[in-house]
């Protein structure tokens, strides 16, 4: 184009529907220039105008020839241009922020603007740039892009931004611009101008303030604090750590904390100091609630459900910031909230949920929530299978009879639809406890009753009970223990009876033993002793307990003696014993030795013995009648160990084995013995009966049984040269080679001649007795042989 003609034609559009084309006027033209603009391929395509721009409807694709005639005082000039959509620039109108607001509590800015989409012919993507600036110096903080779509009508757009710095700390500015990315437009696309700026600021009063206040944040986060102050801030500390100050407008400062550590329960202090003052805020750095662990629901009473859980990892947030829990039951839609005052018991939390009529299956969701987040756990329970009964209370025991009692107790809850399995612990004094299981139908009124049989009369029992449901979830705790004495019954057996004739043979002494408690079945009050023969029965007067002996004057005819024990309920079956022994001429006295504590007696089986065997024993040295104690053993026995606290080592006892048939006893064996043999306590007394030039005859006496302390097995006789009252060694001193020893094992021997001696020589003689328990003490004597003739 010539310099004197219109030049530099440029076209822009802000809505894709109208192009705004403008050109530069020819040089030297003044105000009074008219223009004729003609567009080829358009009907009515010429326009007369007085300015250097024209708005034309957007042209369809292709090239168009534009002719611009400039008509001015000194002639006219014409320019031709080729116009194509590709030469047109799309520059959207400058947007306008309709509203900028702030939520200071969350440090969030809220932005609202209109996209003016109604002026655009088709849908287009729009890119918005939003610029956030901070402080009076308008430092850029954030530049973000935000995508929207034009949809043919004016649309209001909202955008929010959470500031890393509390909004109170500094003025914040916002401006926006847009870029329309139209697929239907092939020309150049450009950004709009930035919108007029909008700002948000907090109006401080004269007081110094620190922000944020009481903020709860996630451990490991970054956070900015600031101090709005009229005086110069000297330092800032988090805990004890100094932080570098970031200067804001005026005297205001900020600090930035990176990767914040978990707070103590009282929070973390952030402190700003000035020359004269100190200002603080508290931050609570913690964790969102962990998924509730080990959620478990059970019921004690089928009236309310108790759900327990463990909170898992500690959140480090307490008080109003602590985790709150809500237990929701999804079938019913009902829920309960955990009150923070209900402090956890040993690390676990619990909630009660009222059971709903006719609902057995419960689908619980436990929601945990704190300022940093939420979590949940779910559990599906059939509550009839999760019964953990209360501890049975009001536990009582009542007699039914001497071997049965009635137990009653209280178990709160409505259990009409289920059965209980209850365990009764039965403990007799000094014996192992027994446990019995009973199944009981659950009831609505909480009172339960069960009968317990197969007990012993007149026995102290300790009872306690615990219950679970038949489907078993957990045993209840044990009830309190109840001690109970069952009632008396008649004694189940007659007393263990024995008899002995008095030493003069005129009286029969009857002995019996107290009945053991499990046979007495009550307190024995007295005994009846009677004596019967073919002709008559004679009863003695009643003998009160604790006398266990009676004496009857009897001739040598055969009588049957009966002994009956009586308690408050009645009499025992009689114990019968014949007065006379069945003779046995074929008896030898045997020796027996025990095993330290007792003595083992054995015998051959005898089919004739139909009642029992009796072993009787007594101290050999005691006078008649010989009875210390006796023991009955069943007729099928062939051995027994006799033990007694009265047995002493080194004491000789007589043992008698009797066999019984038809209440008559026959002596089968007679034994003497020791529980344990000891060495004799004395030496035999000995004398020299005769002396010659080459021999000595010695004679000794028996040692009394009491001092023998075992079965005599022999004598040891020592002799050797030696004189009384000299320094020459005694016979029994060691190392003497000329000592001679004789072991006399024939215990009937009472004399000994020592030959081959030297005449007129002093000899030292020593005698000792021995048993299997050891060698007794020595007795010694000095003898001088006669002179050789």
């Amino acid at each position: 184009q010539k310099k004197g003609a219109p030049h530099d034609l440029k076209c822009v559009t802000n809505n894709l529907q109208v192009w705004d084309c403008y050109w530069k006027a020819p040089s030297g033209t003044g105000r009074g220039t008219d223009y004729e603009v003609c567009i080829e391929n358009r009907s009515h395509s010429c326009y007369q105008l007085e300015k250097t721009n024209i708005k034309i409807p957007a042209l369809s694709h292709g090239d168009y020839e534009i002719t611009i005639n400039s008509l001015h005082d000194f002639g006219s000039s014409t320019s031709k241009f080729t116009l194509n959509e590709q030469n047109v620039s799309l520059i959207p109108d400058t947007p306008e922020i309709l509203n900028l607001s702030a939520d200071f509590s969350t440090s969030t800015l809220y932005l609202k603007w209109n996209d003016r989409g109604s002026v655009f012919p088709h849908h287009s993507n729009v890119i918005w740039e939003i610029k956030i600036l901070r402080k009076e110096s308008m430092e850029l903080v954030k530049l973000v892009t935000h995508n929207t779509t034009l949809n043919g009508k004016d649309t209001l757009h909202h955008w929010s931004w959470a500031s890393d710095m509390p909004l109170e700390c500094a003025i914040h500015f916002v401006e926006i611009r847009c870029y329309i990315d139209s697929l239907h437009f092939s020309g150049r696309k450009e950004w709009s101008d930035w919108s007029p700026v909008k700002n948000i600021s907090w109006m401080p009063d004269s007081q110094t303030k620190v922000f944020p206040q009481d903020k709860v944040i996630l451990v490991g986060s970054d956070i900015t604090f600031c101090c709005i102050s009229q005086e110069k801030v000297l330092s800032a500390l988090i805990g004890h750590t100094n932080c570098p100050l970031i200067h804001l407008d005026g005297e205001n400062v900020a600090i930035k904390i990176h990767n914040i550590s978990v707070s103590a329960s009282s929070g973390t202090n952030v402190v700003f100091t000035t020359e004269d003052n100190i200002f603080g805020t508290v931050i609570f750095a913690g964790y969102p609630p962990d998924t509730p662990q080990q959620l478990n629901c059970e019921t004690h009473d089928l009236k309310e459900i108790l759900c327990r859980w463990n909170p898992g990892r500690a959140t480090a947030l307490v008080g109003p910031r602590a985790t709150s829990y809500t237990l929701l039951e999804s079938f019913s839609g009902k829920y309960v909230r955990f009150k923070r005052a209900e402090a956890p018991t040993n690390g676990s939390y619990q909630l009660f949920f009222q059971m709903l009529p006719n609902q057995e299956i419960y689908n619980f969701t436990l929601n945990a929530h704190n300022p940093l987040g939420r979590s949940e756990s779910t559990i599906l329970v059939n509550i009839t299978e999760k019964v953990y009964p209360h501890t049975p209370t009001s536990f009582k025991v009542k007699d039914i009879n001497s071997t049965a009692v009635k137990l009653s107790w209280h178990l709160p809850g409505n259990f009409a639809k289920i059965n209980f399995l209850c365990q009764i612990e039965i403990k007799k004094s000094n014996t192992v406890q027994e446990q019995r299981n009973v199944t009981i139908k659950g009831v609505e009124n909480s009172s339960y009753l069960v009968a317990l049989d197969k007990l012993n009369p007149y026995t102290v029992y300790t009872f306690r009970i615990r219950c679970s449901t038949e489907t078993f979830w957990k045993w209840s705790k044990w009830s309190n223990k109840k001690q109970h004495l069952t009632t008396e019954a008649i004694p189940s057996k007659g007393p263990d009876t024995w008899r002995e004739w008095s030493s003069d043979g005129k009286n029969l002494i009857i002995y019996w033993k107290p009945l053991p408690i499990n046979e007495a079945n009550g307190k024995i009050l007295s005994y009846n002793v009677s004596c019967s023969s073919d002709e008559e029965t004679q009863s003695l007067s009643e003998i009160p307990d604790p006398q266990h002996k009676a004496e009857i004057q009897l001739d040598k005819n055969d009588y049957i003696i009966s002994v009956v024990a009586k308690n408050s309920v009645g009499s025992s079956p009689p114990s019968k014993i014949a007065s006379m022994e069945i003779p046995n001429d074929d008896l030898k006295i045997e020796q027996v030795v025990g095993m330290g504590k007792g003595i083992l007696l054995t015998w051959h089986y005898d089919p004739n013995m139909t009642c029992d065997y009796v072993i009787k024993w007594c101290n050999s040295s005691r006078s008649e009648p010989c009875l210390m104690d006796w023991r009955k053993v069943p007729s099928n026995s062939t051995e027994t160990v006799i033990e007694s606290d009265q047995f002493r080592p080194g004491v000789r006892y007589n043992f008698f084995l009797y066999g019984c048939r038809n209440q008559g006893y026959q002596l089968l064996r007679s034994m003497i013995g020791y529980i344990e043999e000891l060495a004799p306590t004395v030496a035999p007394n000995f004398t020299v009966e005769d002396t010659s030039a080459d021999s000595i005859l010695v004679k000794w006496e028996d040692i009394p049984v009491e001092e023998l302390r075992g079965f005599l097995r022999g004598y040891l006789f020592y002799f050797g040269k030696g004189e009384r009252d000299t320094s020459k060694m005694r016979v029994l001193e060691s190392g003497r080679s000329d000592i001679k020893v004789k072991n006399i094992t024939d215990i009937s021997q009472k004399t000994l001649r020592i030959a081959d001696l030297q005449g007129k020589t002093s000899y030292h003689l020593v005698l000792r007795a021995y048993t299997d328990g050891g060698v007794g003490p020595e007795k010694s004597m000095y003898v001088v042989t006669k002179e050789n003739s």
Partner: antibody, heavy 122, light 108 residues
């Protein structure tokens, strides 16, 4: 057990000086911030001054700023209040108080002494 | 300076009654920095509540604290004879640390 015992109170003429002491025992004195609080006869409580656990920072109420000085000797477990240019309105029972949190700043006062009476009168 | 006002000035109640004591701050304060003290005649004050709602060691659970921002409350659920005293609130979040004027709880 924690004990705070104030001493040094008495009757003093306006314009004169007085030094109060507070002997601490039963806790790690050097780990706690310490404060002075006063109470005029028949009136409420008024905070006077605070000193940090390590003695690095001290702050005062406007009414005593420039006249009173708080200090501490951690080796002697003792807190002091030097009171200069005393006025009639300084008449009060002066309490020393320990801050609640070990090694923390900005704490409530969990232990107090029984107080010492300062009377400013001509 | 943060000014604390307490109301009512005096509260006349019977033993067993419920006492509700109010403390208002001239500007918003962090609940972490509000305490309540009890003072009996001739005695030093005693810390009851700190951080607005936490009971100090050895304080019975009939004492409870609540509130945030500018309004805080001390509640004594059932007054015992030993609870009749003067109660002060205090802010310790920015110096000068300030006390309220106190509320006297006396026997009706």
């Amino acid at each position: 057990q924690v004990q705070l015992v104030e001493s040094g109170g008495g009757v003093v003429q306006p314009g004169r000086s007085l030094r109060l002491s507070c002997a601490a025992s039963g806790f790690t004195f050097s780990s706690y911030g310490m404060d002075w609080v006063r109470q005029a006869p028949g009136k409420g409580l008024e905070w006077v001054a605070v000193i940090w656990y390590d003695g690095s920072n001290k702050y005062y109420a406007d009414s005593v700023k420039g006249r009173f000085t708080i200090s501490r000797d951690n080796s002697k477990n003792t807190l002091y209040l030097q009171m200069n240019s005393l006025r009639a309105e300084d008449t009060a029972v002066y309490y020393c108080a320990r801050e609640l949190w070990f090694g923390e700043l900005l704490s409530p006062f969990d232990f107090w002494g029984q107080g010492t009476l300062v009377t400013v009168s001509s | 300076k943060i000014v604390l006002t307490q109301s009512p000035g005096t509260l006349s109640l019977s033993p067993g009654g419920r006492a509700t004591l109010s403390c208002r701050a001239s500007q918003s304060i962090s609940s972490s920095y509000l305490a309540w003290y009890q003072q009996k005649p001739g005695q030093a004050p005693r810390l009851l509540i700190y951080a607005a709602s936490n009971r100090a060691t050895g304080i019975p659970d009939r004492f409870s604290g609540s509130g945030s921002g500018t309004d805080f409350t001390l509640t004594i659920s059932r007054l015992e004879p030993e609870d009749f005293a003067v109660y002060y609130c205090q802010q310790y979040g920015s110096s000068p640390f300030t006390f309220g004027p106190g509320i006297k709880v006396d026997i009706k």
